[in-house]
Interface confidence: low
């Protein structure tokens, strides 16, 4: 088992909104749960967009999930990752990071 590296980034979307993207990379096996949570509850599937789980050329895999949120509400959102029985939670970085 190779645990994923998880990275959360943010980018400007429309006025007052930002897109937050959670990327998991370099993991094996390919089965993974990656989802955005608000106030400890997973967002519905129709408010999130997932990338395919793709091989990254090193015998491991990568994927991502993104969602659009209101600027200023970042602290209520976290990216949840579960892989091979391990799980972790990743906050949205502040504007300057």
């Amino acid at each position: 088992t190779v645990p994923p590296m998880v990275n959360v980034t943010r980018s400007n979307a429309s006025e007052g909104n930002i897109t937050v993207t959670c990327r998991a990379s370099s993991f094996y096996p390919r089965n993974i749960i990656l989802t955005w949570r608000q106030d400890n509850v997973s967002l519905s599937n129709d408010t999130q967009q997932w990338g395919d789980v793709l091989p990254d050329g090193n015998g491991t895999y990568q994927t991502w999930v993104a969602t659009r949120i209101c600027r200023g509400e970042e602290q209520n959102f976290t990216c949840y990752m579960e892989h091979s029985g391990n799980h972790s939670t990743h906050p949205v970085p502040s504007n300057g990071s």
Epitope: I33, T35, T78, E82, T89
Partner: antibody, heavy 122, light 112 residues
Framework: QGQMQQSGAELVKPGASVKLSCKTS????????ISWLKQKPGQSLEWIAW????????SYNQKFTAKAQLTVDTSSSTAYMQFSSLTTEDSAIYYC???????????????WGQGTLVTVSA | DVLMTQTPLSLPVSLGDQASLSCRSS???????????LEWYLQKPGQSPKLLIY???NRFSGVPDRFSGSGSGTDFTLKISRVEAEDLGVYYC?????????FGGGTKVEIK
Amino acid sequence: QGQMQQSGAELVKPGASVKLSCKTSGFTFSDNYISWLKQKPGQSLEWIAWIYAGTGGTSYNQKFTAKAQLTVDTSSSTAYMQFSSLTTEDSAIYYCARHDYYGTSGAWFAYWGQGTLVTVSA
Amino acid sequence: DVLMTQTPLSLPVSLGDQASLSCRSSQNIVHINGNTYLEWYLQKPGQSPKLLIYKVSNRFSGVPDRFSGSGSGTDFTLKISRVEAEDLGVYYCFQGSHVPWTFGGGTKVEIK
């Protein structure tokens, strides 16, 4: 599953403040949501608020927004709740509890501290 | 706020009996993500509450299979198939779908 050890009983005067602690061990503190709950003797439970240890983000029951303030100290894996302007109505047992969540399922108060009795009396 | 109403207030049982506890919410408690965050807790005298059931029907780890939860929308039930002495105490239902999260008033299960 880990442990949650709460601070000892408090006897405080009306108008004063009290800061309760919930020291955790046995799990990754920063991955977790910690809630605080209130239970008056012989009564049901009330949810006060939660704090996400990873960022300090909070969500409050509006009833307690002027009364409670939640903080965390990640270096000691400890959650705190400061309760202010105490009245006799605030006399209760206060619990901290840890959320448990996997993927899209969730259990809100999976693991509990032993509770702290706060008595407000002149 | 979502009002959670539990009946009966007290439930006298004989050991080995089946017990059925009811919980009704004042509004539908399906979360926007489609899940129903309805939980059941047992509190014994002088102890912290313990989680039994989450998301209506899922037994928490270590909870015996004599406990089962069911229901949907606004009406929920906890059944204990054969009551044992360690099951006595106050049972609370709880909804975590709508903030503020709220508990029912409790049902006390005691010896008949």
